[in-house]
């Protein structure tokens, strides 16, 4: 019968040829009376057999990632008779893996959005690298993820590639971060290959800023001839948040005379001071009122940022008009 062990050949051998093993018939007494032949895909081009000894050699560099298995056939012939000594037999040559492929991030570019002020441990995104080497061959395709850029705000789970928040971030200070993740094979041991990817992490706004008046005092004038409903001036607050988190409502906090009102222009986010009752210079020539401003939408969990509304003082001078 045929005698052989399992055949393995390392990929990417840089030698001219590589001895893989020996195929022989147990009837072969070593006197060169038998001739061994190799058949099948790769015979003669990738593998050769020493026809006298049955020794098999790889005669070209192999790439496991291109082809990991070769199925060949062997024949052994008695030179004197030309007859087969053994039935033709099929055998397998497996290409064994070396760590010749670096991890690659296939889903680039990565981009994630996470709310500002998210607590430590909040999941941002998972990045995944793949390695073309054999996952069953040692640690050639076992990856470890690490953070090259992004501390102290982010961390990455070494085995999963899950990026989490490790420190609270304020969008109003910085609204986006570039995080660089490295994937290293061989679980980081010597001889490891690595790949990197960049993740753009954008912070979405939360309502963590209350509106604040630009001025602590506004001076306005109103003609005593102005009808009710007249807009006598505008006041303005600023809010570091954006979008609906910066929408605000102005209101009167103090107006003993109940002469004025404030309405909000939601397009410009300005407060418009309106005359609610007609004024008479001869009766009262100036007024002092206090206005306050608050955000339109404040979720319950963010109320801590909005405890005291910003206020401003408005001095209104009444202008005299000659009366007939």
């Amino acid at each position: 019968g045929w005698v052989w062990n399992q055949f393995f050949v390392p990929e990417e051998m840089n030698t001219t040829s590589h001895h893989i093993g020996q195929l022989r018939s147990d009837l072969d007494n070593g006197n060169n009376s038998f001739q061994y032949k190799l058949l099948g895909a790769g015979a003669g081009s990738t593998f050769i057999i020493d026809e006298r000894t049955g020794d098999i050699y790889a005669i070209q560099k192999l790439d496991r990632e291109e082809r990991s298995l070769y199925i060949l056939r062997a024949q052994v012939i008695d030179i004197a008779t030309g007859r087969a000594v053994e039935p033709e037999s099929e055998f397998v040559i497996k290409v064994s893996d070396i760590n010749d492929n670096e991890p690659k991030f296939l889903d680039e570019p990565y981009e994630a959005i996470v709310p500002e002020m998210s607590p430590e441990g909040t999941l941002v995104i998972q990045v995944t690298a793949s390695d073309a080497d054999d996952p069953s061959s040692g640690n050639n395709a076992r990856l470890l993820y690490s953070l090259l850029q992004g501390q102290p705000y982010f961390s990455v789970e070494p085995t999963t590639g899950v990026i989490r928040i490790s420190s609270k971030m304020d969008r109003e200070l910085q609204d986006e971060y570039w995080v660089i993740i490295q994937a290293k094979d061989m679980i980081g041991q010597p001889g490891a290959l690595s790949g990197t990817t960049s993740v753009l992490i954008k912070l979405s706004d939360v309502n963590d800023n209350k509106p604040i008046f630009k001025e602590s005092l506004y001076r306005l004038t109103v003609s005593e001839s102005a009808p009710t409903g007249t807009s006598i001036g505008t006041i303005m607050a600023y809010d570091n948040d954006i979008g609906e988190n910066a929408e605000m409502d102005y209101s009167i906090e103090e107006d003993d005379s109940q002469t004025f009102d404030i309405i909000t222009n939601h397009e410009t986010q300005e407060g418009i001071v309106i005359l609610k009752k007609k004024v008479d210079f001869e009766h009262q020539n100036h007024y002092g009122i206090r206005a306050k401003v608050k955000n339109h939408h404040v979720p319950e969990q963010l109320m801590k940022y909005h405890t005291e509304a910003s206020t401003t003082f408005i001095k209104i001078q009444v202008e005299d008009v000659d009366e007939p």
């Epitope: 840089n14 020493d50 000894t53 020794d55 050699y57 005669i59």
Partner: antibody
């Protein structure tokens, strides 16, 4: 017995081309790798190129890469070397040599007498 | 590439003397080394392959030894036809490379 007979050498101007042939007999040509080795006048041996038995694998010395092409016609048991962009330093006797068996597949167990290539203006 | 260094460049010996030729590889080439003999106006002839296996028809007075980086060709007793140039060659890595040769001449 194994015989190798080279032909095609001669005088050629720099930048010119030549095609060398090596006719083989006495062995199963397609089962063996074949080589070209050259020897400049009064100098040592220099490997030029190798081709595997089926012709799938070819290898070249850095000095000839991109200029020389090795090929074979197994039906005619003939090995070829197409030499382009020839230079004065390519002047040499060109030998073809048969590969061996097994671990000596890319060896040189039988040599032809050689053909002289002279590159000169 | 692997650099093959042969020594000595010339060896002057008398008939019947023992000749020892050395060949050193710049890095390990296992046992993938061949020795060739070349006489003036002739093609090289294979003497030894696999560092120590004699080629067909080569007399027993020629023997090879060594592995890795250090190799030796020994001619136990020089015959008149042995005076020639001897080359070592590695076939473990591409490009295949030859040593510069050792000339064995009659003293």
């Amino acid at each position: 017995q194994v015989q190798l007979l080279e032909s095609g050498g001669g005088l050629v101007q720099p930048g010119g081309s030549l095609r060398l042939s090596c006719a083989a007999s006495g062995f199963t040509f397609s089962s063996y790798a074949m080589n070209w080795v050259r020897q400049a006048p009064g100098k040592g041996l220099e490997w030029v190129s190798t081709i595997s038995g089926g012709g799938a694998n070819t290898y070249y010395a850095e000095s000839v890469k991109g200029r020389f092409t090795i090929s074979r016609d197994n039906s005619k048991s003939t090995l070829y070397l197409q030499m382009n962009s020839l230079r004065a330093e390519d002047t040499a006797v060109y030998h073809c040599a048969k590969g061996g068996m097994g671990g000596y597949y890319y060896g040189m167990d039988v040599w032809g007498q050689g053909t002289l290539v002279t590159v000169s203006s | 590439e692997i650099v093959m260094t042969q020594s000595p460049v010339t060896l002057s010996l008398s008939l019947g003397e023992r000749a020892t030729l050395s060949c050193r590889a710049s890095q390990s080439i296992s046992s993938n080394l061949a020795w060739f003999q070349q006489k003036p106006g002739q093609a090289p002839r294979l003497l030894i392959y696999g560092a120590f296996t004699r080629a067909t028809g080569i007399p027993a007075r020629f023997s090879g030894s060594g592995s890795g980086t250090e190799f030796t060709l020994t001619i136990s007793s020089l015959e008149p036809e042995d005076f020639a140039v001897y080359y070592c060659q590695q076939y473990n890595y591409w490009p295949l490379t030859f040593g510069g040769g050792t000339k064995v001449e009659i003293k």
